[in-house]
């Protein structure tokens, strides 16, 4: 048993048929010694008396808010949550496996630049009685600070018969050095509590591996005289790291016809302009990627040829 926060405790249970459970001793936080009784949740049934209560925790029915009283007055509370371990592996019932980039990916994180700011998100089908708390650090043995905000519900989607809820959190490395080579990964830890079930999820990554630039901005077309060609120009996104001479992007320019089946013409360039043939009803799209480290491409920025 360990303390998650004040008056909230997590009991780690091996979860299998006829498991013996864990013996837990609760102590009433009071100087009083006599006349103390214990109850669980809203029930008025007295579970025991005395300053300590010893219980055998085997299942969710044994978890909940234990309260000690004296003479009708509440003295203190202890909330017991369960963390299930099945065959040596902690349960992952609360969050949905996103399966990208590999199986058992529960947390996904992205950064728009090298400033040390990043966003993580996760999915669940649970809509109520759900709380998250997020901690992060750089390295685990001698951790350096990363500050995370509160997790918030950022999207709701319908997936077949189910609703899916996306939560996200923003974190910022306290003393980030954008130009430095990373040797220790960022560690992100999410505590999830659904009713009386506790789970924790972790992700470990280097900022360089989760970079996804914003799309190029100010995408413009300039027709070339007496030609079907146009000059496409764009600018680095405002959110990208500076100076651009050091934090350079490479770009992919794509001409796509109205029909998805039509052949796409693609050009790769390190410049912020390119000359392409603009077909009728086609559109021109540009996306960006870190020039020196192949992390994710940005989403496309698009303009119609007409």
């Amino acid at each position: 048993i360990w303390e998650l926060k004040k008056d909230v405790y997590v009991v780690e249970l091996d979860w299998y048929p006829d498991a013996p459970g864990e013996m837990v001793v609760l102590t009433c936080d009071t100087p009083e010694e006599d006349g103390i009784t214990w109850t669980l949740d809203q029930s008025s049934e007295v579970l025991g008396s005395g300053k300590t209560l010893t219980i055998q925790v085997k299942e969710f029915g044994d978890a909940g808010q234990y309260t000690c009283h004296k003479g009708g007055e509440v003295l203190s509370h202890s909330l017991l949550l369960l963390h299930k371990k099945e065959d040596g592996i902690w349960s992952t019932d609360i969050l949905k496996d996103q399966k990208e980039p590999k199986n058992k990916t529960f947390l996904r994180c992205e950064a728009k630049n090298y400033s040390g700011r990043f966003t993580c998100w996760w999915l669940t089908t649970i809509s109520t009685d759900l709380t998250f708390s997020v901690k992060s650090s750089r390295g685990s043995s001698d951790p350096q600070g990363v500050t995370c905000g509160a997790a918030t519900l950022s999207a709701e989607r319908v997936r077949g018969d189910n609703k899916e809820y996306e939560y996200s959190v923003e974190c910022q490395e306290d003393s980030a050095c954008p130009a430095a080579e990373e040797s220790l990964p960022i560690e992100v830890m999410v505590d999830a509590v659904h009713k009386l079930k506790y789970e924790n999820y972790t992700s470990s990554f280097f900022i360089r591996d989760i970079i996804k630039p914003d799309p190029p901005k100010n995408l413009q077309l300039k027709p070339l005289k007496n030609s079907r060609q146009v000059e496409v120009s764009w600018e680095y996104p405002d959110t990208w790291s500076t100076p651009h001479s050091y934090f350079s992007l490479t770009f992919c320019v794509q001409v796509q016809g109205k029909s998805k089946r039509e052949k796409k013409d693609r050009v790769f360039t390190d410049k912020t302009s390119a000359t392409v043939i603009c077909r009728k009803n086609a559109s021109i799209s540009v996306r960006a990627q870190d020039r020196y480290y192949s992390s994710s491409w940005s989403e496309w920025a698009s303009v119609p040829c007409s």
Epitope: D87, G88, T92, K102, K104, E187, T202, F205
Partner: antibody
Framework: AGTLDESGGGLQTPGGALSLVCKAS????????VAWVRQAPGKGLEWVAG????????GYGSAVRGRATISRDNGQSTVRLQLNNLRAEDTATYYC??????????????????WGHGTEVIVAA | GLTQPSSVSANPGGTVEITCSGS???YGWYQQKSPGSAPVTVI????KRPSDIPSRFSGSKSGSTATLTITGVRAEDEAVYYC???????????FGAGTTLTVL
Amino acid sequence: AGTLDESGGGLQTPGGALSLVCKASGFSFRSYDVAWVRQAPGKGLEWVAGIGSTGRCTGYGSAVRGRATISRDNGQSTVRLQLNNLRAEDTATYYCAKESGSGGCGWAIYRIDAWGHGTEVIVAA
Amino acid sequence: GLTQPSSVSANPGGTVEITCSGSSGSYGWYQQKSPGSAPVTVIYQNDKRPSDIPSRFSGSKSGSTATLTITGVRAEDEAVYYCGGYDRSNSSGLFGAGTTLTVL
């Protein structure tokens, strides 16, 4: 699939300490739990210690509990096993083993899908 | 602990089954061709086979017993096979004592 390379073995004196290092390459090391397994001469395999993917969760076999410390550096893709107060019965070949997933503490050895070549430790006066 | 037979034998081309029983919910199988040589995983998590292991190796689990089956046994399969599991009583890894497969 990736490789695991152990180092740090050799002749050790009783009562002394040793530090074994497992260096991983060729896979996303920080995504997996890792275990140390040993084999004494003429005996079977014995789970020694394990560590979860982030390094916060650890476990130890009864023969080394209280004398062993397992740690990992995900930046360097290494796992270290420190064993103190060495005994003759610690003489064995020590293998580093990778589990196929995370979420445990390196004790779910039914998930081991890759092994190192081993490093031999001899404890003798 | 985990219980497995100390030895089994098979004819070349035949089929052999090695069992492992205990309280673990999942099992793995590890082949060691000689003492001191590194074990090789032939099956992990009951029935998963690493990509470099021949398809003649398969694993299954029924109740609390796991079975390693080798169909079309070959001379090079002669080895000691260890099963591995998880000991719930004290949160630790656990190996069987090993089964020696002799190819006749």
